[in-house]
C-alpha cells in the first residue's frame, strides 16, 4: 500500500523539514528559514513563531519544529503553547479581576500564580497546629492534642521538622 | 460597547516626532494590557509595543527601540505612543488595540478590539 501511495502522489515522500514544491515538479524542497514542517508530505511550510516584546524564545525554530515561547521574569505563560503572558502576583496574593489582592485570613499562596486556598484543617486528622499559617505558608500539623498530654508515655523523638526552634522546610 | 479611537497622525519629516494617542471607553480601561501595531503601505500588520495593564512593563518591536515610548493614563483612559527620531520606514497606519484577559499580554492575533488607526507619514 505504501508503495502503490507513492506512486500515486510522490509527495508522501517528502519528509518532514520538506516541502512538495509544485513549481519544480513537485520534488521535494527544504522549507525556506523562518519556516517549518514538522510532518511528511507537506505542501508547505508553516511560518515559524516569532517569540516577542513579552514572549522569550525557549525553544528555537528549526526545519521540523516550531518556536516555543515562555515569558519574561515577572510573567507567567497561560494557554496552549503559551499563547498569552500573565501577570505574577506575589506570594501570599492571588490576581483578581481587579488586580493583585491578598490572600483572606485562613488561607495562602505560596507561589506567584494561582488562588489563595485554604490552611490545611489539622484537626480533620485528629492533629493540632503546630506552626501557624500566614498568607505565604499553609499551616504545619504535628502530633494529635492527646500525644502531647503530660502523661503520654511516648519515648519516640519527634521527627527533625517539628524540632523545637526550626521551621520546616 | 467597546471603543477605541487613535488621534495624532500626520505628515513629518524624517528626524521629527509625533505622538498618537488612543483614547478608549467602554470597559475597565486599567485592567488590560494594551498595544499599538502598525501597517504600512502594501504590508502586514506589523507589532510595535505593548503596555501591561499598570504601565509599569512595555516591550518594543527591536526597529522601535529606543525611539518609541508607549505609555497610559489609567486616570484619563488613554494610551500614548512617542514617537521620536522618525524614519521613512515608520509610515504606516497605527491602530491601537485591547488584549482579551485582564493582566495578561496576548499575541497579535489575540487582541479582541481595534482602533480605526490614524495615519503616519514621513517624508521631506
Known amino acids: 500500500f505504501e508503495r502503490t501511495r507513492s506512486l500515486q502522489d510522490p509527495c508522501s515522500n517528502c519528509p518532514a523539514g520538506t516541502f512538495c514544491d509544485n513549481n519544480r515538479n513537485q520534488i521535494c524542497s527544504p522549507c525556506p528559514p523562518n519556516s517549518f514542517s514538522s510532518a511528511g508530505g507537506q505542501r508547505t511550510c508553516d511560518i515559524c513563531r516569532q517569540c516577542k516584546g513579552v514572549f522569550r524564545t525557549r525553544k528555537e525554530c528549526s526545519s521540523t519544529s516550531n518556536a516555543e515561547c515562555d515569558c519574561t521574569p515577572g510573567f507567567h505563560c497561560l494557554g496552549a503553547g503559551c499563547s498569552m503572558c500573565e501577570q505574577d502576583c506575589k506570594q501570599g496574593q492571588e490576581l483578581t479581576k481587579k488586580g493583585c489582592k491578598d490572600c483572606c485570613f485562613g488561607t495562602f499562596n505560596d507561589q506567584k500564580r494561582g488562588i489563595c486556598r485554604p490552611w490545611t484543617n489539622c484537626s480533620l486528622d485528629g492533629k493540632s497546629v503546630l506552626v501557624n499559617g500566614t498568607k505565604e505558608r499553609d499551616v504545619v500539623c504535628g502530633p494529635s492534642p492527646a500525644d502531647l498530654s503530660p502523661g503520654a508515655s511516648s519515648v519516640t523523638p519527634p521527627a527533625p521538622a517539628r524540632e523545637p526552634g526550626h521551621s520546616p522546610q | 460597547q467597546v471603543q477605541l479611537v487613535e488621534s495624532g497622525g500626520g505628515l513629518v519629516q524624517p528626524g521629527g516626532s509625533l505622538r498618537l494617542s488612543c483614547s478608549a471607553s467602554g470597559f475597565t480601561f486599567s485592567s488590560y494590557a494594551m498595544s499599538w501595531v502598525r501597517q504600512a503601505p502594501g504590508k502586514g500588520l506589523e507589532w510595535v509595543s505593548d503596555?501591561?495593564?499598570?504601565?509599569?512593563?512595555?516591550f518594543y518591536e527591536d526597529s522601535v527601540k529606543g525611539r518609541f515610548t508607549i505609555s497610559r493614563d489609567n486616570a484619563k483612559n488613554t494610551l500614548y505612543l512617542q514617537m521620536n527620531s522618525l524614519r521613512a520606514e515608520d509610515t504606516a497606519v497605527y491602530y491601537c488595540?485591547?488584549?482579551?484577559?485582564?493582566?495578561?499580554?496576548?499575541?497579535?492575533?489575540?487582541?479582541?478590539?481595534w482602533g480605526q488607526g490614524t495615519l503616519v507619514t514621513v517624508s521631506s
Open positions: 503596555i501591561n495593564s499598570g504601565g509599569e512593563s512595555t
Open positions: 488595540a485591547k488584549h482579551p484577559l485582564t493582566f495578561t499580554i496576548a499575541t497579535m492575533n489575540d487582541y479582541d478590539y
